[in-house]
Amino acid sequence: MRTEAQVPALQPPEPGLEGAMGHRTLVLPWVLLTLCVTAGTPEVWVQVRMEATELSSFTIRCGFLGSGSISLVTVSWGGPNGAGGTTLAVLHPERGIRQWAPARQARWETQSSISLILEGSGASSPCANTTFCCKFASFPEGSWEACGSLPPSSDPGLSAPPTPAPILRADLAGILGVSGVLLFGCVYLLHLLRRHKHRPAPRLQPSRTSPQAPRARAWAPSQASQAALHVPYATINTSCRPATLDTAHPHGGPSWWASLPTHAAHRPQGPAAWASTPIPARGSFVSVENGLYAQAGERPPHTGPGLTLFPDPRGPRAMEGPLGVR
């Protein structure tokens, strides 16, 4: 069992909870409801999990649901750097990953999501209220940031409702294009809810699948959407005690440096990969306005020729930036 804090998900209730209600009539309203609720939320979602077997071990997962090609992802805890936050990992799609203790493993899960595992310290319930923040940047178009933390209760069913906040800092084109569909969906949802108003509403359950396991495909982006959804993903297991945190310093190297090739298996491409992309279900959501930081004093090694700050489509290993040719 896991304790989770997540941004609302585009995910239906688990099979078997519908009772006498038909599966189709149950899933569609709830998918539409989620779309309506999340229509105005930021494009970044954050999921924090604490393993029951290792109560001091955390997995942070972050994803970017907007259009645009991400050129850098930063994961931190304790808030933004101006308020005492500490960088746990920095992930670049071409040049690799930097991470600092207590981060144990940071990696790209998909092109639009990352995960970070934090080492456990053995305490029974460390840092239950620790805030983890993820910042996705696409230079120079803009950056997007969101934060999340474990709910006060360890019962996933008692997760706090999402608190969307206006933290987007880039073009909203691509999001606005969906508004028409959402409007129609919301109207249709109201119609369906009126038809089923005398039936008991099913409970949305948080997913208990592993971060890598495919989830119910209640909302799989169309191929057109897939082209616009380029999001890095990272997982982190960390020890959650600031006192024991091995803080990185500007002139000190990272605890270790991993240079990941762009064809790494953690960054699948194509419709199949997108269809199985895990999407968080729900939880607490906190916005952070100022930037995060990473103590990266030394320039990381290049993984090979042709590596790019702005991924270049002309290269064999590259991707193009979000705005295309002007």
Epitope: L72, G82, R98, K135, G291, A294, G306, F310, D312
Partner: antibody, heavy 120, light 106 residues
């Protein structure tokens, strides 16, 4: 050692054109976004153009949009700024600068600058 | 675009004195940087993303802030620190700079 060397500046009449160059060395040029930043006689700094590492995406502030064009030749490790329809307010010292993504796109290296004077 | 206002425009300090200058943004900023420029030289990166020292920058320099308010502090002024300091933000394009704070040696 990272080096950025600008050239091409000079005196030009209003409405005229000028092409600046920035020769880069000491790093993998094709891996970095680059910008042109100018400093006016009043010592104000203004970013006038940014280009991604592959040379595909370019960005300009409204003050120069349609008049300035940034480009790069990664094979020659050179950044360019084509300036046309020049105005007196374009008079400035023009610097090329490198953006380092692991420093959150800070401009970590700057050239020595080339002076552009627009006057009749 | 985001406008950055630096204050004071000009200040002076004696060697060993603590110096603090501020940079106020017209709206919330994602990334803040500080540059130092001496007469006849190009700008030099001091601090990136609010509080991180660039390579080779003395530890007497520090940055802090969040949202719309940022500051650069020199814990103990030294003669070589006399220069003009610029803040720069990146939130979305265009990148913008403050007008600068000129720090003179008293």
């Amino acid at each position: 050692e990272v080096q950025l060397v600008e050239s091409g500046g000079g005196l030009v009449k209003p409405g005229g054109s000028l092409k600046l160059s920035c020769a880069a060395s000491g790093f993998t040029f094709s891996s970095f976004a680059m910008s042109w930043v100018r400093q006016t006689p009043a010592k104000r700094l203004e970013s006038v153009a940014t280009i991604n590492n592959g040379g595909i995406n370019t960005y300009y502030p409204d003050t120069v949009k349609g008049r300035f064009t940034v480009s790069r030749d990664n094979a020659k490790n050179t950044l360019y700024l084509q300036m046309s329809s020049l105005r007196s307010e374009d008079t400035a010292m023009y610097y090329c600068a490198r953006h380092d993504d692991f420093l959150y796109y800070a401009m970590d290296y700057w050239g020595q600058g080339t002076s552009v004077t627009v006057s009749s | 675009q985001i406008v950055l206002t630096q204050s004071p425009a000009i200040m002076s300090a004696s060697p060993g004195e603590k110096v603090t200058m501020t940079c106020s943004a017209s709206s919330s900023v994602s990334y803040m940087y500080w540059y130092q420029q001496k007469p006849g030289s190009s700008p030099r990166l001091l601090i990136y993303d609010t509080s991180n020292l660039a390579s080779g920058v003395p530890v007497r320099f520090s940055g802090s802030g969040s949202g719309t308010s940022y500051s650069l502090t020199i814990s103990r002024m030294e003669a070589e620190d006399a220069a003009t300091y610029y803040c720069q933000q990146w939130t979305s394009y265009p990148l913008t700079f403050g007008a600068g704070t000129k720090l003179e040696l008293k």
